[in-house]
Amino acid sequence: LDLSNVQSKCGSKDNIKHVPGGGSVQIVYK
């Protein structure tokens, strides 16, 4: 099972990509 592309819901924000709005978001960061 390849989990290399799975993004943590509770990890740090260090890897957040700057997207142009909420329409581009995959998950909601807490």
């Epitope: 957040i16 700057h18 142009p20 709005g21 909420g22 329409g23 978001v25 995959q26 909601v28 960061y29």
Partner: antibody
Framework: QVQLVQSGAEVKKPGSSVKVSCKAS????????ISWVRQAPGQGLEWMGE????????YYNEKFKGRVTITADKSTSTAYMELSSLRSEDTAVYYC?????????????WGQGTLVTVSS | DIVMSQSPLSLPVTPGEPASISCKSS????????????LAWYLQKPGQSPQLLIY???TRESGVPDRFTGSGSGTDFTLKISRVEAEDVGVYYC????????FGQGTKVEIK
């Protein structure tokens, strides 16, 4: 408690540039987007653009592309908005706001506003 | 560009009475992955900076009185004030953040 403190009022000549600053305190500056919004006298709110200080990445309103430049200095937690080729229609109050990036994408803290007057 | 349209543009109200403001977007603001509508409501009181009231179309910002209620999904949204108070006067703006940011024209709420 997050606070955004903007620079003081400016009077500029047509054709010149203005640079407004927005100093943030009380939060992690690089975790949020700083947006710039302007309001001409008696008019509504108009979004100009935003910066993600962590990466320096920006997005702009097409209307202002080529005339506006938004930058950020992480070391001083300060964002800047520079508008060039000023005309009388640019007379407005300019606000910076913290955009709660990654969650609500809503502007939950606002600066006090900076009045820029363009007059010959 | 996403266009935001508010109505009415002016709303005279009687204290203690309800009030309602409509906001329509030119395209859906619903992200099917996060199941959130990226629509916020702001109030700008006279002489002040705008303040956030509602985000995600219906989530009240901390400290906002529960007489303010946001509803709607997709392209049609509503802000309701159950009982208007004198301190509620000002200009109300809806704003989309689905793609970039766009504000509605604003609705001026004033006491009759």
């Amino acid at each position: 408690q997050v606070q955004l403190v903007q620079s003081g009022a400016e009077v500029k000549k047509p054709g010149s540039s203005v640079k407004v600053s927005c100093k943030a305190s009380g939060g992690i500056f690089s975790d949020y987007v700083i947006s710039w919004v302007r309001q001409a006298p008696g008019q509504g709110l108009e979004w100009m653009g935003e910066i993600f200080p962590r990466s320096g990445s920006t997005y702009y309103n097409e209307k202002f592309k080529g005339r506006v430049t938004i930058t950020a200095d992480k070391s001083t937690s300060t964002a800047y908005m520079e508008l060039s080729s000023l005309r009388s229609e640019d007379t407005a109050v300019y606000y910076c706001a913290r955009d709660y990036y990654g969650t609500s994408f809503a502007m939950d803290y606002w600066g006090q506003g900076t009045l820029v007057t363009v007059s010959s | 560009d996403i266009v935001m349209s508010q109505s009415p543009l002016s709303l005279p109200v009687t204290p203690g009475e309800p009030a309602s403001i409509s906001c329509k977007s030119s395209q859906s603001l619903l992200n099917s992955r996060t199941r959130k509508n990226y629509l916020a409501w702001y109030l700008q009181k006279p002489g002040q900076s705008p303040q956030l009231l509602i985000y995600w179309a219906s989530t009240r910002e901390s400290g906002v009185p529960d007489r303010f209620t946001g509803s709607g999904s997709g392209t049609d949204f509503t802000l309701k004030i159950s009982r208007v108070e004198a301190e509620d006067v000002g200009v109300y703006y809806c704003k989309q953040s689905f793609y970039l940011r766009t504000f509605g024209q604003g609705t001026k709420v004033e006491i009759k």
